[in-house]
């Protein structure tokens, strides 16, 4: 369809109907319409209609397909990482050491300068490097608010391996509440705990904690303490953005 | 490109070259290369490198763009749906009643009859409709095992609503086991319990249970009581499939 | 599925992923980008040869649906399917940048 | 996007999703589908106007990559992007079957 | 390759009965419809009626010419289909044959057919 | 019950020719009619199935058209292996019933 020829709609639209008739019956194995001599009389039966209903239901609520990515994600993201708070800093004393948890603090201003509005993170992760696990572990990810209550983001199973592994996690909501607030943020990283708890020890070792004792948060282990990495638009191309929003 | 002219590669290959030079570019909002005047002398700096393949590294880990669909997933599926087996019978006996749990079975040989080989299967949700509900809730779906154990499945957020609504999972790879195994098999819906662990009351309502006491399992509303929504390659589809497998 | 498996190691006329390594210095002339050196961007190309409305052939068209015109179009092009971002290193003036691009290497196609 | 929030509601010439509603028993002389009578098929169509070497228009050419060549193909083609499914309801002899048929609606289009 | 083979055909007296048998092979037989079309001499082909598949639960439907004096059957294990007639006249004299239905509403594949004749 | 009416029995041609052999539906019937071949010696086969889809090994010969109650069979080229008999039938709707035939002939 170059720009110089004009362009038949309706032959377009009627090529389109026949694609549709092949490939309706393409998709289910017909090589022709079923014929309709058998079909009883009278409505389709409830049970029918309901699980019809059930599957388009289904479509509305969930697409079936990915989102297309939206303009700004067309254009190249700066990557930075911030590492997380050494543990000697003061915030991790308010923290119990306890037996199914791991904290990690973040630096905001760090964050900031890295993304300078919360409008450009585009994406950001919690990378962990755990260490060689003899068995699998459900664990979660706990994000901190100054009342020092934690919300509920992610579980995860931990396989059982011989190799140390990265672990990552999609923190993107909670780094960009962040952007906008305190001056220290942290994770929490628990086993999962049930109901009728029985040993909800974490097992899991988290590259940067010492492997003495869950709680006795030591040394880091040179740069691959846990850290976020971020994907952002840098701000000069932000602004490019904006001025462009206008479609072509 | 049609099949009649005799395709240049090395004209569309200069091309595509082109392209990529002009779509870098534009990716990085630069209207011509960075000068390099200022590029300090020697190695990239260790940290750099070491963004560079975290950076990387996600890449190789989890590709950014979802896999293409298999050449299975073209095909209609059928759906079919499989209801709760109710709960007069004798399965729920064997689970205490709790204030923090309830538990939905399902029987086997019906799922069997909707899909008769496991490699069939393409999809299942569990479908509960979930009654209105004040305060938001996190809660957790586990799958039995034979030996009353529970694996987790999912985690999800409830959030507090004026409707009723409702709520799907994926358990494509419970159902995927249970069509290989046993008679009956069932889901336990819990809410979050945390370590350090207050009221662990499951607060969601969910439509088929009575909602006077938590435990006490007893009318189903009708069709509305928790079902398996299966999508699955009909038999006589899926021999077609396998006898096509040449390419082309 | 048209990726870099099947179609590396066929003679696919139609359709099909086609390899081609990017080298930025020899084939771009640039020398600002310090990592990679250059990457597999690969590209799409071959005819989709849907015949629309031959009803004599009906049973071969529809058996050719899936590869040929998946997507019921008008006139089916080959495009890419799945793609896969690329992080580069440059310097802007003394400072190094990390970027990520997005959708840089295609690694199947498909007729849509 | 080149959705249909943005195409259905302009006059946009280069491509975008095309409103199509196909009526199973007008546009295809089926009775055979029961449910739904018909569904929002759409289409896409129009150029990707990519200059692809023309250097003095190069900063023009580079606004315009997003729209109209983002992936950077030697031969940008109008194609779906984002796609849903559809479920129907037919017989097979008497047996009454509900069926979901992936990529069904085109809901954008994007040169690729 | 898909082959029918219809076998049972011969000379029947007014009011007698007789059972034709179909041999079916090359395909999954549980899954098609099979069907019985008569052709008496000289005529056009009449579809007499048909035993539905395994989904349809091996169903059966005939013609008003038929009802109630023709019985189709089939035995699954040994891929064979059976038209039971009873109560016979001189109209029933035709080459009987067994053919695979499919839900297109056609038949795709023919027996070599087996004649059946009705006189005193 | 649907009539299916051939209103030619017979048909006389010469090898190479091009013939057409005619099929009306006392109603609608959707596009379901299927033609059938039945050689001198009895043998049925199927030709076209849904007006115009030619069944698998059946030559490209032989093409079918037609919609609503009107559908006709198109030999080109005849040979003298179309030698036979042709049969038009309704996938419509129930009981499935067959028109009267067409019988070719060489001149």
């Known amino acids: 369809l170059s720009t110089c020829k004009t362009i038949d709609m309706e032959l377009v639209k009627r090529k389109r109907i026949e694609a549709i008739r092949g490939q309706i019956l393409s998709k289910l194995r017909l090589a022709s319409p079923p014929s309709q001599g058998e079909v009883p009389p009278g409505p389709l039966p409830e049970a029918v209609l309901a699980l019809y209903n059930s599957t388009r239901d289904r479509v509305a609520g969930e697409s079936a397909e990915p989102e297309p990515e939206p303009e700004a994600d067309y254009y190249a993201k700066e990557v930075t990482r911030v590492l997380m708070v050494e543990t000697h800093n003061e915030i991790y004393d308010k923290f119990k050491q306890s037996t199914h948890s791991i904290y990690m603090f973040f630096n905001t201003s760090e964050l900031r300068e890295a993304v300078p509005e919360p409008v450009l993170l585009s994406r950001a992760e919690l990378r962990l490097l755990r260490l060689k696990l003899k068995v699998e572990q459900h664990v979660e990810l706990y994000q901190g608010y100054g009342n020092a209550s934690w919300r509920y983001l992610h579980g995860r199973s931990v396989r059982a391996t011989a190799d140390d592994e990265w672990l990552s996690f999609d923190v993107t909501d909670a780094v960009h509440q962040w952007l906008s607030g305190g001056e220290i943020e942290g994770f929490r990283l628990s086993a999962h705990c049930s109901c009728d708890s029985r040993d909800n020890t974490l097992q899991v070792d988290i590259n940067g904690f010492t492997t003495g004792r869950r709680g006795d948060l030591a040394t880091i282990h040179g740069m691959n303490r846990p850290f976020l990495l971020l994907m952002a638009t840098p701000l000069e191309r932000a602004q490019h953005l904006q001025s462009s929003r206008h479609r072509r | 490109l049609s099949t009649c002219k005799t395709i240049d590669m090395e004209l569309v290959k200069r091309k595509r070259i082109e392209a990529i030079r002009g779509q870098i570019l534009s990716k990085l909002r630069l209207a011509s290369p960075p000068s390099q005047g200022e590029v300090p002398p020697g190695p990239l700096p260790e940290a750099v490198l070491a963004l560079y393949n975290s950076t990387r590294d996600r890449v190789a880990g989890e590709s950014a763009e979802p896999e293409p669909e298999p050449e299975a997933d073209y095909y209609a599926k059928e759906v079919t749906r499989v209801l709760m087996v109710e709960t007069h019978n004798e399965i729920y006996d064997k689970f205490k009643q709790s204030t923090h749990s309830i538990y939905m079975f399902f029987n086997t040989s019906e799922l069997r009859e909707a899909v008769p080989e496991p490699v069939l299967l393409s999809r299942a949700e569990l479908r509960l409709l979930r009654l209105k509900l004040k305060v938001e809730q996190h809660v957790e779906l586990y799958q039995g095992y034979g030996n009353a154990s529970w694996r987790y499945l999912h985690g999800r957020s409830v959030r507090a609503t004026a409707d009723d609504e409702w709520l799907s999972f994926d358990v494509t790879d419970a159902v995927h086991q249970w069509l290989s195994g046993g008679e009956i098999e069932g889901f336990r819906l819990s809410a979050h319990c945390s370590c350090d662990s207050r009221d662990n009351t499951l607060q969601v309502d969910i439509n088929g249970f009575t909602t006077g006491r938590r435990g006490d399992l007893a009318t189903i509303h009708g069709m509305n009581r928790p079902f398996l929504l299966l999508m699955a390659t009909p038999l006589e589809r899926a021999q077609h499939l396998q006898s096509s497998r040449h390419r082309r | 599925a048209l990726d870099t498996n099947y179609c590396f190691s066929s003679t696919e006329k139609n359709c099909c992923v086609r390899q081609l390594y990017i080298d930025f210095r020899k084939d771009l002339g640039w020398k600002w980008i310090h990592e990679p050196k250059g990457y597999h961007a690969n590209f799409c190309l071959g005819p989709c040869p849907y015949i629309w409305s031959l009803d004599t052939q009906y049973s071969k068209v529809l058996a050719l649906y899936n590869q040929h015109n998946p997507g019921a179009s008008a006139a089916p092009c080959c495009v890419p399917q799945a793609l896969e971002p690329l992080p580069i290193v440059y310097y802007v003036g003394r400072k190094p940048k990390v970027e990520q691009l997005s959708n840089m290497i295609v690694r199947s196609c498909k007729c849509s | 996007a080149l959705d249909t929030n943005y195409c259905f509601s302009s006059t946009e010439k280069n491509c975008c999703v095309r409103q199509l509603y196909i009526d199973f028993r007008k546009d295809l002389g089926w009775k055979w589908i029961h449910e739904p009578k018909g569904y929002h098929a759409n289409f896409c169509l129009g150029p990707c106007p990519y200059i692809w070497s023309l250097d003095t228009q190069y900063s023009k050419v580079l606004a315009l990559y997003n729209q109209h060549n983002p992936g950077a193909s030697a031969a940008p083609c109008c194609v779906p992007q984002a796609l849903e499914p559809l479920p129907i309801v037919y017989y097979v002899g008497r047996k009454p079957k509900v069926e979901q048929l992936s990529n069904m609606i085109v809901r954008s289009c994007k040169c690729s | 390759e898909v082959k029918l083979v219809e076998s049972g055909g011969g000379l029947v007296q007014p009011g007698g009965s007789l059972s034709l048998s179909c041999a079916a092979s090359?395909?999954?037989?549980?899954?098609?419809?099979m069907s019985w079309v008569r052709q008496p001499p000289g005529k056009a082909l009449e579809w007499l009626g048909f035993?539905?598949?395994?989904?349809?639960?091996?169903?059966?439907e005939y013609s008003a010419s038929v009802k109630g004096r023709f019985t189709i059957s089939r035995d699954n294990s040994q891929s064979i289909l059976y038209l039971q007639m009873n109560v016979l006249r001189a109209e029933d004299s035709a080459t009987y044959y067994c053919?695979?239905?499919?839900?297109?509403?056609?038949?795709?594949?023919w027996g070599q057919g087996t004649t059946l004749t009705v006189s005193s | 019950d649907i009539q299916m009416t051939q209103t030619t029995s017979s048909l006389s041609a010469s090898l190479g020719d091009r013939l057409t052999i005619s099929c009306r539906a006392s109603?609608?019937?959707?596009?379901?009619l299927n033609w059938y071949q039945q050689k001198p010696d009895g043998t049925v086969k199927l030709l076209i199935y849904?007006?115009?889809r030619l069944h698998s090994g059946v030559p490209s010969r032989f093409s079918g058209s037609g919609s609503g109650t009107d559908y006709s069979l198109t030999i080109s080229n005849l040979e003298q292996a179309d030698i036979a008999t042709y049969f038009c039938?309704?996938?419509?709707?129930?009981?499935?019933?067959f028109g009267g035939g067409t019988k070719l002939e060489i001149k």
């Open positions: 053919a695979r239905y499919t839900g297109g509403g056609y038949f795709d594949y």
């Open positions: 090359g395909f999954t037989f549980t899954d098609y419809y």
């Open positions: 035993i539905r598949n395994k989904p349809n639960g091996y169903t059966t």
């Open positions: 109603q609608d019937i959707s596009n379901y």
């Open positions: 849904y007006t115009s």
């Open positions: 039938q309704q996938g419509d709707t129930l009981p499935w019933t």
